[in-house]
């Protein structure tokens, strides 16, 4: 058993049918010695008396808010949560496996640049009685500071019969140098509590591996005289690291017809312009990627040919 | 990245072209190592990230772009030098700071070259003959060193009398390649910045 926060305790259980569970001793936070009784949650049934209460915690029915009273007055509370270990592996019931970029990916994180700021998000089908708390650091043995905000519900989607909820959090490394070569990964730890179930999820990454630039901005077309060709031009996104000559991007320009089946023409360039043939009803899209370290491509920025 | 990219202008400052070749070569070599050594811990998540140049060179700090010198976190409480202007064209006068940056890059290359050559000698003794260093990568390191045109003492190749532990050697190869790829990215960024200056 360990303390998650004041008066909230996590009991770690080897989870299998007929498991013996864990013996837990609760102590009433009071100078009083006599006339103390204990109850669980809203029940008025007295579970025991005395300054300490010994319980065998086996199932969720044994978890909850234990309260010690004296003469009708509440003295203190202890909330017991359960953390299930199933055959040597901590349970992952609360969050959905996003399966990207690989199986068992519960937390996904992205950064728009090298400033040390990043966003993480996760999915669940649970809509109520759910709380998250996020901590982060650079390295784990001698951790350097990363500050994270509160996790917030950022999207709701309907997936088949289920509603899916997306939560996200923004974090900022306290002292980040964009040009630094990372040797210690960022660690992100999310505590999730659903009713009386506790779970924790972690992700470890280098900022360089989670870079995903914003799409190029100011995408414009300039028709070339007496030609079906157009000059496409764009700019680096505002959120990208500067100077751009040091943090360079490479670009992919795509001409796509109205029909998804039509052949796509693609050109790769390090410049911020390209000359392409604009077909009727086609659209031109441009996306960006770090020129020197191949992390994710940005989303497409698009304009119609007409 | 196996994608068609416009070729650089011939008038471009030569180090940029060599540094681009270097990044391509080390990235290819790392990819090959990860595929060949699939049963070894060779992915970014599995290896220890060690920097053999740590406390010996200070490339990141010495080559920091002027725009980042205002960032306290980049100064790292060391005596830092900043790139001002110049290139590695012999005809242009390079500033003192710039020379410091380029000599730091040169020292990095020299250290990695020695490590890789020593390692290759060990790998050639492996009866499994599982993996060797790409000669192209070693040649590209050499070309960039020549383009930088610094004279420094030659570091003797390390020789060891004991029987090599091939498992450890292959894991060390992975560690070295990951670190060298990261340094090659920095070198490419620096050359790109200098080229634009």
């Amino acid at each position: 058993i360990w303390e998650l926060k004041k008066d909230v305790y996590v009991v770690e259980l080897d989870w299998y049918p007929d498991a013996p569970g864990e013996m837990v001793v609760l102590t009433c936070d009071t100078p009083e010695e006599d006339g103390i009784t204990w109850t669980l949650d809203q029940s008025s049934e007295v579970l025991g008396s005395g300054k300490t209460l010994t319980i065998q915690v086996k199932e969720f029915g044994d978890a909850g808010q234990y309260t010690c009273h004296k003469g009708g007055e509440v003295l203190s509370h202890s909330l017991l949560l359960l953390h299930k270990k199933e055959d040597g592996i901590w349970s992952t019931d609360i969050l959905k496996d996003q399966k990207e970029p690989k199986n068992k990916t519960f937390l996904r994180c992205e950064a728009k640049n090298y400033s040390g700021r990043f966003t993480c998000w996760w999915l669940t089908t649970i809509s109520t009685d759910l709380t998250f708390s996020v901590k982060s650091s650079r390295g784990s043995s001698d951790p350097q500071g990363v500050t994270c905000g509160a996790a917030t519900l950022s999207a709701e989607r309907v997936r088949g019969d289920n509603k899916e909820y997306e939560y996200s959090v923004e974090c900022q490394e306290d002292s980040a140098c964009p040009a630094a070569e990372e040797s210690l990964p960022i660690e992100v730890m999310v505590d999730a509590v659903h009713k009386l179930k506790y779970e924790n999820y972690t992700s470890s990454f280098f900022i360089r591996d989670i870079i995903k630039p914003d799409p190029p901005k100011n995408l414009q077309l300039k028709p070339l005289k007496n030609s079906r060709q157009v000059e496409v031009s764009w700019e680096y996104p505002d959120t990208w690291s500067t100077p751009h000559s040091y943090f360079s991007l490479t670009f992919c320009v795509q001409v796509q017809g109205k029909s998804k089946r039509e052949k796509k023409d693609r050109v790769f360039t390090d410049k911020t312009s390209a000359t392409v043939i604009c077909r009727k009803n086609a659209s031109i899209s441009v996306r960006a990627q770090d020129r020197y370290y191949s992390s994710s491509w940005s989303e497409w920025a698009s304009v119609p040919c007409s | 990245r196996n994608l068609p990219v416009a070729t650089p202008d011939p008038g471009m400052f030569p180090c940029l072209h060599h540094s681009q070749n270097l990044l391509r070569a080390v990235s290819n070599m790392l990819q090959k190592a990860r595929q060949t050594l699939e049963f070894y811990p060779c992915t970014s998540e599995e290896i220890d990230h060690e920097d053999i140049t740590k406390d010996k060179t200070s490339t990141v700090e010495a080559c920091l772009p002027l725009e980042l010198t205002k960032n306290e976190s980049c100064l790292n409480s060391r005596e830092t030098s900043f790139i001002t202007n110049g290139s590695c064209l012999a005809s242009r006068k390079t500033s003192f700071m710039m020379a410091l940056c380029l000599s730091s890059i040169y020292e990095d290359l020299k250290m990695y070259q020695v490590e890789f050559k020593t390692m290759n000698a060990k790998l050639l003794m492996d009866p499994k003959r599982q993996i060797f260093l790409d000669q192209n990568m070693l040649a590209v390191i050499d070309e960039l060193m020549q383009a930088l045109n610094f004279n420094s003492e030659t570091v003797p190749q390390k020789s060891s009398l004991e029987e090599p532990d091939f498992y450890k050697t292959k894991i060390k190869l992975c560690i070295l390649l990951h670190a060298f790829r990261i340094r090659a990215v920095t070198i490419d960024r620096v050359m790109s910045y200098l080229n634009a200056s």
């Epitope: 080897d14 299998y16 007929d18 199933e86 055959d87 040597g88 019931d93 690989k102 | 599995e46």
Partner: antibody, heavy 115, light 112 residues
Amino acid sequence: QVQLVQSGGGVVQPGRSLRLSCAASGFTFSSYGMHWVRQAPGKGLEWVAFIRYDGSNKYYADSVKGRFTISRDNSKNTLYLQMKSLRAEDTAVYYCKTHGSHDNWGQGTMVTVSS
Amino acid sequence: SYVLTQPPSVSGTPGQRVTISCSGGRSNIGSMTVKWYQQLPGTAPKLLIYGNDQRPSGVPDRFSGSKSGTSASLAITGVQAEDEADYYCQSYDRGTHPALLFGTGTKVTVLG
């Protein structure tokens, strides 16, 4: 006392269907994940499928994906394996089993796919 | 296809020490726990070892498990006639958990 009692096995022709049941008692069935494991005559153990405690997630071996469906009825304390488009290579003893460091197995039920 | 490899058979005389190996990889035994089962003819498997080296109550202490790197092993110290059975190791793969990975199985024969 944890008990898993299996039923539903038998002889079936290729291409036909069969449903296996596993009735649980002696524990809170709705709190635990469950597996199906099979063993072809004279062969080793092969995992078939898994279902979470609440039925929210199901996992299948590639060899049965799209043909077999694992399900549970927590109100009846019963685990099921619906097997469709049966093949000769599905002939085996099928076991249900609890998920956890200590596990309990059903007695096994024989499924024979033969024309 | 089995990714956990066991020897098809091992044998020993009563009182001898018999060991069975189970060889896997970094993503299974290398990073997950291992179980061992004993299966007597016509019966369901019986758990002998969980968590690499833990013995459930009721399992004789002549059975012991260990794990090193990407391999695990089961030792029977002082093998007895009633130990003649098939033995299976089981683990998970960190990418496909909770799918069970079973070893190929080992037939233990007690001679004499």
